[in-house]
Interface confidence: low
Amino acid sequence: DSSKWVFEHPETLYAWEGACVWIPCTYRALDGDLESFILFHNPEYNKNTSKFDGTRLYESTKDGKVPSEQKRVQFLGDKNKNCTLSIHPVHLNDSGQLGLRMESKTEKWMERIHLNVSERPFPPHIQLPPEIQESQEVTLTCLLNFSCYGYPIQLQWLLEGVPMRQAAVTSTSLTIKSVFTRSELKFSPQWSHHGKIVTCQLQDADGKFLSNDTVQLNVKHTPKLEIKVTPSDAIVREGDSVTMTCEVSSSNPEYTTVSWLKDGTSLKKQNTFTLNLREVTKDQSGKYCCQVSNDVGPGRSEEVFLQVQYAPEPSTVQILHSPAVEGSQVEFLCMSLANPLPTNYTWYHNGKEMQGRTEEKVHIPKILPWHAGTYSCVAENILGTGQRGPGAELDVQYPPKKVTTVIQNPMPIREGDTVTLSCNYNSSNPSVTRYEWKPHGAWEEPSLGVLKIQNVGWDNTTIACAACNSWCSWASPVALNVQYAPRDVRVRKIKPLSEIHSGNSVSLQCDFSSSHPKEVQFFWEKNGRLLGKESQLNFDSISPEDAGSYSCWVNNSIGQTASKAWTLEVLYAPRRLRVSMSPGDQVMEGKSATLTCESDANPPVSHYTWFDWNNQSLPYHSQKLRLEPVKVQHSGAYWCQGTNSVGKGRSPLSTLTVYYSPETIGRR
């Protein structure tokens, strides 16, 4: 009952004499495990016996396997799923039907498999894509309906009998669906492969040839062209003729159109395999090629470079670099279209020929301002001399020249003036755009190139300016030569070196630190009274009356400056001493009498001594002598002596009269 048995295996298996066959097979018996299996060769059902007749290649029963007369047939299956078989080696007479007789406890089944064994190894089959185009990658497939674990084989690709360098990928299939060996080769055919023979060769494990398949490649490609030119070097002169011929060396499919191109642009009305150029001009110089098209596309020949020789064209000059900086290097290049290239050049500067300059380039290592101007050139080749072109301008840039700092003020300049200076220059390229001043004082610049110094100092500043374009050029410094009144005037005592005593010789000096102009006059003053006009003020014998506040003045043409007041101090011993009495020189007894020692002294009196009419010193040392109460016996002449650090002085006698009081007289 077929509904109870399900088999899967290849329908037909292929092999050759001496090889092997591996039959992948699966089955399912729905009513239980397999109990008996017999492999028949070409089985025939015998209706009389209700059994199959035929050669039994393999047999197994529930008692176990029955050894066959040869071990070349193996059942590799099991009792419920696998029915795989192997025949190794396989022989020509194994061709035909293989019958798998299967019996379970209740059911029987005969499964038939076709085996095709050839006398010699059969060839593989090459599969090609429907169309092959040059440079497009294709996959070539070589297929052989054979694979067996016991008989390794290999597939080798050959092009025109030579092994192909490209790596092939070989795969095998031994499944219930299919049994094969396949080799795939990725390949980018070139037009030159068209018509070539590709072979897939079947080899055994040792590389021995077994069989092969061959195909001829049909590679579609654009036309392949060769261009020929007369003259062969493609060098002509204006007026000559040139012939170019286009030859098709290969085209698949056949070509359809022909055209010619110059410098990549199609030439009109040139659709034949020959291009004739008559009386060529220099404009016809260029790269020529022919183009032939077929269904695949256009093919182009190699380019022929046609050179039409002519005399130089009017030249132009290129300057590297302009504007040029003074002192830098400059290169001039003479550019003139010519064929062949010019061999000689003539150079001109401002229309005048530059001697000894015959090269394409002129190099000036150190540019100076006079190099500025128009440069032109003439080129020459074997065909003639060109014309001089318009030329090029060289602009030579340099720092400002001959820069000077100019004082605009009327001279002389006086301290406190506002000084205006200008910065002048002779020439400059490019134009002066700014100015700088040294020293960089905190000054004002009301306009470019002019510096205004307000309230100029006395200290004789030197000023320099720079005129600047891209560079700064400094002028030599100019001295402002500022004139000013005498400075730092002071009184200085020259002698004596120590303190001044009455009677000393004294000299005072009027000093000042500086004056511009140098010519000065001196004035000495005491209490607004002019004393002298020399730098020194001298006292042969100083007296106390000379003491006081002295000033000296120094003046020049700019102005006069006074010193601070200087105090002259004269030291002398006490003098002009006298004794004064209070309330008077006649005093009544019992009252109070005060005697004062008055004096003139410098320094002041430090010590007093009192004397009576007997020249007896009294025990009193202060300036005042107080008698209280005064007695009649105090009457008499008194004098005093004053002492300071310089010396002593004494007063004349002064008489004190003490008279009796009315009370005393009354008692008498």
């Epitope: 020293p439 004082g441 905190a442 000054w443 307000q454 100092g457």
Partner: antibody
Framework: EVQLLESGGGLVQPGGSLRLSCAAS????????MSWVRQAPGKGLEWVSA????????YYADSVKGRFTISRDNSKNTLYLQMNSLRAEDTAVYYC?????????????WGQGTTVTVSS | DIQMTQSPSTLSASVGDRVTITCRAS??????LAWYQQKPGKAPKLLIY???SLESGVPSRFSGSGSGTEFTLTISSLQPDDFATYYC?????????FGGGTKVEIK
């Protein structure tokens, strides 16, 4: 790097004196005018004094004229401000500043300042 | 002496705002004007000199204009770093004088 560093500030009694210094580095000191600017606490900026690059020209605000003296020692790259007869209103942060070339550029570099406090 | 008057004295603005500060001189000072920025506890920084020239390293959002007696400092798009006090200063003649300052604060 152009730098200005002031020093010499401190507490001083009215009528006293103080000398501020400003050490310059990173530029050609003698080529530039220099200036002192002060700022009283919570107030705006007040220009005090300026001196030319050579030291030959000096300029003062009316409020300090006769009491303050600006000077410089180009060999030491140092700017000075001698402040005499100080008053309470002189209390401020004192900045020294570099004056741009020829006064075209204002005061382009400033120090961090030094504080002067005048108080009894 | 030349008096410099700045306005406004205080200005409240937000990040991204266009800010304009004005400075007026009591007499013509040509173009001799500088603008400074000062942050608390720091020294002033020069922004603009000669009325409109941008000091090296100062962002291009700062610009100055004017001549004679009327001058303007403009910040095209205020950034967080720009909140500070700004001073103008004339150096046309001595004594140099500053404006009273404009404090730019966050709105």
């Amino acid at each position: 790097e152009v730098q200005l560093l002031e020093s010499g500030g401190g507490l001083v009694q009215p009528g006293g004196s103080l000398r501020l210094s400003c050490a310059a580095s990173g530029f050609t000191f003698s080529s530039y005018a220099m200036s002192w600017v002060r700022q009283a606490p919570g107030k705006g900026l007040e220009w005090v004094s300026a001196i030319s690059g050579s030291g030959g020209s000096t300029y003062y605000a009316d409020s300090v004229k006769g009491r303050f003296t600006i000077s410089r020692d180009n060999s030491k790259n140092t700017l000075y401000l001698q402040m005499n007869s100080l008053r309470a209103e002189d209390t401020a942060v004192y900045y020294c500043a570099k004056v741009g070339i020829s006064s075209l550029h204002g005061m382009d570099v400033w120090g961090q300042g030094t504080t002067v406090t005048v108080s009894s | 002496d030349i008096q410099m008057t700045q306005s406004p004295s205080t200005l409240s603005a937000s990040v991204g705002d266009r800010v304009t500060i004005t400075c007026r001189a009591s007499q013509s000072i040509s173009s001799w004007l500088a603008w400074y920025q000062q942050k608390p506890g720091k020294a002033p920084k020069l922004l603009i000199y000669k009325a409109s020239s941008l000091e090296s390293g100062v962002p291009s959002r700062f610009s100055g204009s004017g001549s004679g007696t009327e001058f303007t400092l403009t910040i095209s798009s205020l950034q967080p770093d720009d909140f500070a006090t700004y001073y103008c200063q004339q150096y046309e003649r001595f004594p140099w004088t500053f404006g009273g300052g404009t404090k730019v604060e966050i709105k």
